[in-house]
């Protein structure tokens, strides 16, 4: 099948980095400067992406692969293939319509992007707050309050078996 196809279509022999040049009797010609073809058998080469403005070049364009961009310091990538750059905020902030704003009390953001998230509610897991949360850091949950009562050992012994219907004293 491959041999048949190549007999029928001489362009299928053109490797990546070249194109099948109809103007030159379907000879495989190298991609011109600032263009590439990532697969064989292509009739045109694609224009290389240019990393301009807030974008900077992460990987140069070659004859067989497109350039890759990332964002200038103070910005981060958005979208597939870093199609956009969005400004960073400081830790403890989130990006709102009005720019970077501090996290509200009870929320935190430990990154330069994304939104402020609520502190962990330790009591939902029956634990106590060991280290308070800040705008930049979540709370640290510690042992349950009962485990911290005077005389309690660091290892909680198994609870004694109780008869059904009896409430704990």
């Amino acid at each position: 099948f491959e041999r048949t196809r190549s007999l029928q279509d001489p362009c299928s022999n053109c490797p990546a980095g070249t194109f099948c040049d109809n103007n030159r009797n379907q000879i495989c010609s190298p991609c011109p400067p600032n263009s590439f073809s990532s697969a064989g058998g292509q009739r045109t080469c694609d224009i290389c992406r240019q990393c301009k403005g807030v974008f900077r070049t992460r990987k140069e364009c070659s004859s067989t692969s497109n350039a890759e961009c990332d964002c200038t310091p103070g910005f981060h990538c958005l979208g597939a293939g870093c199609s956009m750059c969005e400004q960073d905020c400081k830790q403890g902030q989130e990006l709102t319509k009005k720019g970077c704003k501090d996290c509200c009390f009870g929320t935190f953001n430990d990154q330069k992007r994304g939104i402020c998230r609520p502190w962990t509610n330790c009591s939902l897991d029956g634990k106590s707050v060991l280290v308070n949360g800040t705008k930049e850091r979540d709370v640290v949950c510690g042992p349950s309050p009962a485990d911290l009562s005077p005389g309690a050992s660091s290892v909680t012994p198994p609870a004694p078996a109780r008869e059904p219907g009896h409430s704990p004293q």
């Epitope: 807030v54 956009m84 319509k97």
Partner: nanobody, 123 residues
């Protein structure tokens, strides 16, 4: 080719005014959020203001609120920044940038930038 070209910068005394313009070409200007950024000498890029597709939503960094006004004229493919009551700390290169095409919550993503125009506020 998608292009943004800023103009209107210059030297102005404190308390003075300037109007920056940004001409857009190569894309459907009215479909995109547009933004102004600035970069003061030795500093990083700072977002200044943005405006939605029809000009009904405008947002500003706190330090310029009430002094700078962003606007657009979709018929002329133009973005503007009216700068009043200028201060020394407004000295910077001002860039216009193309934002997102949708009406999503991310109003600060950009992909195309102009070359910038310099504003110097000094007596």
């Amino acid at each position: 080719e998608v292009q943004l070209v800023e103009s209107g910068g210059g030297l102005v005394q404190p308390g003075g005014s300037l109007r920056l313009s940004c001409g857009a070409s190569g894309f459907t200007f009215s479909s995109y959020w547009m933004l102004w950024f600035r970069q003061a000498p030795g500093e990083g890029l700072e977002w200044v203001a943005n405006i939605n597709q029809d000009g009904s939503e405008k947002y500003y960094v706190d330090s310029v609120e009430g002094r700078l006004t962003i606007s657009r004229d979709n018929a002329k493919n133009a973005l503007y920044l009216q700068m009043n009551s200028l201060r020394a700390e407004d000295t910077a290169i001002y860039y216009c940038a193309r934002g997102g095409e949708g009406y999503s919550d991310s109003h600060h993503g950009t992909d195309v930038w102009g070359q910038g125009t310099t504003v110097t506020v000094s007596s």
